[in-house]
């Protein structure tokens, strides 16, 4: 080994990664909200729609105060990976009716991937345990009908909206602890 020498700073540090994750999450939340509103305009929802393969909501307002950094980041990454796969599936399986939303769904998928990359980088830099994201619990087969894919889109966007909403709050809270 040679004599001690300093290393130049890399592009970001964990706190900057967390700031970046907050910005990306907020931006993704706004996109999801807008896309969900477009969906409601084009295909009015008759009540709430569920999809068994979607993750259950990780947090409620009451549990925010007890959040720990590892748990939040691990759960958020696993849940977002599930939503990423669901959006992928929706784009592949969507009938002609949803094709009009393809550009928006494509942009949503790309932003989700970017946020997932940022969360993983943050977890690596903090050396937090990184559980391998599971495949969706229920295999995602083709929707039974055109209306089936519309109902699935409502469920996916609604669930993603709620997940991102708690994610923003959780990440902002974690900023104070890092």
């Amino acid at each position: 080994p040679g004599p001690p020498a300093g290393s130049p700073r890399v592009s970001s540090d964990p706190r900057a990664d967390l700031d970046s994750a907050v910005l990306l999450t907020r931006s993704l939340l706004a996109d999801t909200r807008q896309l969900a509103a477009q969906m409601r305009d084009k295909f009015p929802a008759d009540g709430d729609h569920n999809l068994d393969s979607l993750p259950t909501l990780a947090m409620s307002a009451g549990t925010l105060g007890s959040l720990q950094l590892p748990g939040v980041l691990t759960r958020l990454r696993v849940d977002l990976m599930s939503y990423f796969r669901h959006v992928q599936w929706l784009r592949r399986a969507a009938g002609p009716s949803l094709k009009t939303l393809e550009p928006e769904l494509g942009a949503l998928q790309a932003r989700l991937e970017r946020l997932l990359r940022r969360l993983q980088l943050l977890m690596s830099r903090l050396a937090l345990p990184q559980a391998a994201p599971d495949q969706p619990a229920v295999p995602l087969g083709p929707p039974a009908s055109a209306w089936g894919s519309i109902r699935a889109a409502h469920a996916i966007l609604g669930g993603l909206h709620l997940t991102l909403d708690w994610a923003v709050r959780g990440l902002l809270l974690l900023k104070t602890r890092l």
Partner: antibody, heavy 114, light 111 residues
């Protein structure tokens, strides 16, 4: 400028112990997970151990589990590696590294030989 | 034996483009874990070259680029220069080890 400065290496007999230290400066040490990575002479890189930013998580390579202990003191910006029951195959340059790892020290040589 | 597989050597002439591959498994690269690349010049410590599959730290020339697909990744170096002669290592988190794993390294020779 980021600096990681390892110390504590040297010649030790098989079965002996050594404690390596790594002094960090130029970045927020307490915000980074820290690793020890080693490189045997003429060989590739082998990850040894990692400790999370706050010290709550520690993981070890199978080859050192039960013999090596990683720890950190965030108030002193220092990382440690306590190495016990040393074997000839532990001979290597030991690097302290931060983050991904994003930053690496220059390494300290540990030689285990009788 | 390394968990990630790299070719032991690669070579090219100045100005050429060379690619170094890195093959993993379902517990590391294939599990959506990011790949990082390091350059180790003779007699020096490794240096981060590419992180998160394709991002460059500040100061790394854009001649270096990374990509990832499935269970493998690759590092491309275009406009090869004599100072690129070094050992290159890929790395990724491995869920079965709860830590990062490295490739065996590729010695790049500029002819």
């Amino acid at each position: 400028e980021v600096q990681l400065l390892e110390s504590g290496g040297g010649l030790v007999q098989p079965g002996g112990s050594l404690r390596l230290s790594c002094a960090a400066s130029g970045f927020t040490f307490s915000s980074y997970g820290m690793h020890w990575v080693r490189q045997a002479p003429g060989k590739g890189l082998e990850w040894v151990a990692v400790i999370s930013y706050d010290g709550s998580y520690k993981y070890y390579a199978d080859s050192v589990k039960g013999r090596f202990t990683i720890s950190r003191d965030n108030s002193k910006n220092t990382l440690y590696l306590q190495m016990n029951s040393l074997r000839a195959e532990d001979t290597a340059v030991y690097y302290c590294a931060a983050g991904v790892p994003d930053y690496w020290g220059q390494g300290t040589l540990v030689t285990v030989s009788s | 034996q390394s968990v990630l597989t790299q070719p032991p050597s690669a070579s090219g002439t100045p100005g050429q483009r060379v690619t170094i591959s890195c093959s993993g498994s379902s517990s590391n690269i294939g599990s959506d874990y990011d790949v990082h690349w390091y350059q180790q010049l003779p007699g020096t410590a490794p240096k981060l070259l590419i992180y998160s599959n394709n991002e460059r730290p500040s100061g790394v020339p854009d001649r270096f680029s990374g990509s990832k697909s499935g269970t493998s990744a690759s590092l491309a170096i275009s406009g090869l220069r004599s100072e690129d002669e070094a050992d290159y290592y890929c790395s990724a988190w491995d869920s079965s080890l709860s830590g990062p794993v490295f490739g065996g390294g590729t010695k790049l020779t500029v002819l």
